[in-house]
Amino acid sequence: ECGHISVSAPIVHLGDPITASCIIKQNCSHLDPEPQILWRLGAELQPGGRQQRLSDGTQESIITLPHLNHTQAFLSCALNWGNSLQILDQVELRAGYPPAIPHNLSCLMNLTTSSLICQWEPGPETHLPTSFTLKSFKSRGNCQTQGDSILDCVPKDGQSHCSIPRKHLLLYQNMGIWVQAENALGTSMSPQLCLDPMDVVKLEPPMLRTMDPSPEAAPPQAGCLQLSWEPWQPGLHINQKCELRHKPQRGEASWALVGPLPLEALQYELCGLLPATAYTLQIRCIRWPLPGHWSDWSPSLELRTTERAPTHHHHHHHH
C-alpha cells in the first residue's frame, strides 16, 4: 500500500467538520517524486488539500471538510496515473446524531406467555447503528433502592419492544425499568418506570355467548338481547370490571358502550335496542379495583333482537 488515510473521527455529528490526512510512503518509487494528492468524497473531487513533504520523505495531504452532510460516504485520496485516477486509500465516513431519549415506555404483563412486554418510541432517526437495551432491577420499595439486576433484554433489530421472561420477574414486587439507547455518538436513557408486573396485567377477554333459553324463563322483550359470557379461566380469580359495546350490523352507527359490568354478572339483558335488528356485540375487561390494562375486545357475537309484537292500536294505525 502506497497511501494511508487517517481521520479525526470516522463518525461525526451530521454537519460537523472532519479532518483527514493522506500519507504517501517514500518507497513508492514508481510514483512521481512530487505527486499531487487528490481528495474525493464519494464521486466528487474535493479541493482544499494542503500538501507537504515530511522530513522522512513521505508526502502528506491534509484536508478539512467543513460540513459532513452525508450520513454515509467514502473519502479517498488518489493520484493522477496516466489518464486515470489511482486510488491510494479510502475510509468510510458516517454522520448522524446521538440517540434521543427513548420516550413513551410502557409495559404490560401477559399471563399467557408469563412475560412482561415493554415497548417504547425510539425517537428520531439517528442515521447510525443504534442499539436499544431494556434494563431493569428488582426493588423492595419504590425503586429508590436497587435490588438484584435483571438480565438485559435486547430487542431484535429494528424492534422497539422486548419481553422479560417470568424467571426474571417477581410478581407483587416493584421493578425499575428503563431503556438505554447507544450509538457511536452517545448514550441516552428513558425516564425510569417503577411498577409491579401485576399492576400492568392485561387479561384475555371473556367469550360472549347467546343465553340458552330455559323453558321457565321469559323470552327477551322487543328491543332486548339476552347474552352471557364465559370468563377467561386463568384470570378468574382476578377481580375485574367489564364493558360491552354494541352496534347495528347495518348502517354506519358507531359503537355504543354499556358498563361497567362486574365480571361475575356472567349474563346480561341488554335493552333499549331497535327491534328486529341484527347487532354486533363485544366485551372487554380490566383488573379492578387494582390497576391493570384493558383486555382486547372479545371476538364479536352477532344477535338479533325480537320483533315488536303488534298491538291492537298499532294494527289500527296501519288502516
Epitope: L111, R166, H237
Partner: antibody
Framework: EVQLLESGGGLVQPGGSLRLSCAAS????????MGWVRQAPGKGLEWVSS????????PYADSVKGRFTISRDNSKNTLYLQMNSLRAEDTAVYYC???????????WGQGTLVTVSS | DIQMTQSPSSLSASVGDRVTITCRAS??????LNWYQQKPGKAPKLLIY???NLQNGVPSRFSGSGSGTDFTLTISSLQPEDFATYYC?????????FGGGTKVEIK
C-alpha cells in the same frame, strides 16, 4: 395479620348434614375468592369448592357437586360450607383458604375435622 | 380436567442435599403452578406461586421452575425443618387439582 378460623366440624352419620364456618380477619374479605380444601386421613389434598368475591361464581369438585353448597357473608367476613348427604368418604380435615389472584391458596386455616360414621 | 402427577411419591435425603421434586400436568397450564409444604398435623403452607415466585418469608433455598406441562421444585440445601410433604397445584382452570404429594424423609 391474615387469620382464618374454621369451626363446625364433628361426628355425623352417613346421610346427615353439617355446616362449616370460616371466620376471616386481617384482610378485605369482600375482595377475595375463598375456597375449601380437604384432606382425608393419611391422604393428599383435595380441592372441594371455591367462591368468587361477591359469591356469584361457585365451582365444585365432581365428588361433592349437588351435595355441598359454598356461600359467604361479606358483612360478617365469614365463609360457609353446607354439607348434605354426607358419606364415609367425606371424612377429612376441612381447610378454608384465601385464594390469590392467580389461583394459589394462602393462607390456610388450621382445619376442622369432619367424621362421617355410623 | 387437568390432572397433576407428582414424582417421586417419597424420597430419603440428608441435611445439605439438593432435592428435586417434579410435577407434570396432563395438559399445558402456562405458569399456573403452585407449591405447598405440609408438616404432620399442620395446615399446608404456600412456598411458590405462578411456577417460580417465592412467597414472602420462604427461604431462598426453595425455588421453582418450568412452564407448560413440566415443573420442578428444588431445595438447594436441605435443612432439618424441610422434612415434610410437598404438593403441587394447578390453578389454570377449574376443577383445581393437587398432585399426590412427595414425602421428604430423613435418610
Amino acid at each position: 395479620e391474615v387469620q382464618l378460623l374454621e369451626s363446625g366440624g364433628g361426628l355425623v352419620q352417613p346421610g346427615g348434614s353439617l355446616r362449616l364456618s370460616c371466620a376471616a380477619s386481617g384482610f378485605t374479605f369482600s375482595l377475595y375468592w375463598m375456597g375449601w380444601v380437604r384432606q382425608a386421613p393419611g391422604k393428599g389434598l383435595e380441592w372441594v369448592s371455591s367462591i368468587s368475591s361477591s359469591g356469584g361464581v361457585t365451582p365444585y369438585a365432581d365428588s361433592v357437586k349437588g351435595r355441598f353448597t359454598i356461600s359467604r357473608d361479606n358483612s360478617k367476613n365469614t365463609l360457609y360450607l353446607q354439607m348434605n348427604s354426607l358419606r364415609a368418604e367425606d371424612t377429612a380435615v376441612y381447610y378454608c383458604a384465601k385464594l390469590g389472584e392467580l389461583g394459589w391458596f394462602d393462607p390456610w386455616g388450621q382445619g376442622t375435622l369432619v367424621t362421617v360414621s355410623s | 380436567d387437568i390432572q397433576m402427577t407428582q414424582s417421586p411419591s417419597s424420597l430419603s435425603a440428608s441435611v445439605g442435599d439438593r432435592v428435586t421434586i417434579t410435577c407434570r400436568a396432563s395438559q399445558g397450564i402456562s405458569s399456573y403452578l403452585n407449591w405447598y409444604q405440609q408438616k404432620p398435623g399442620k395446615a399446608p403452607k404456600l412456598l411458590i406461586y405462578y411456577a417460580s415466585n417465592l412467597q414472602n418469608g420462604v427461604p431462598s433455598r426453595f425455588s421453582g421452575s418450568g412452564s407448560g406441562t413440566d415443573f420442578t421444585l428444588t431445595i438447594s440445601s436441605l435443612q432439618p425443618e424441610d422434612f415434610a410433604t410437598y404438593y403441587c397445584q394447578q390453578s389454570f382452570m377449574y376443577p383445581l387439582y393437587f398432585g399426590g404429594g412427595t414425602k421428604v424423609e430423613i435418610k
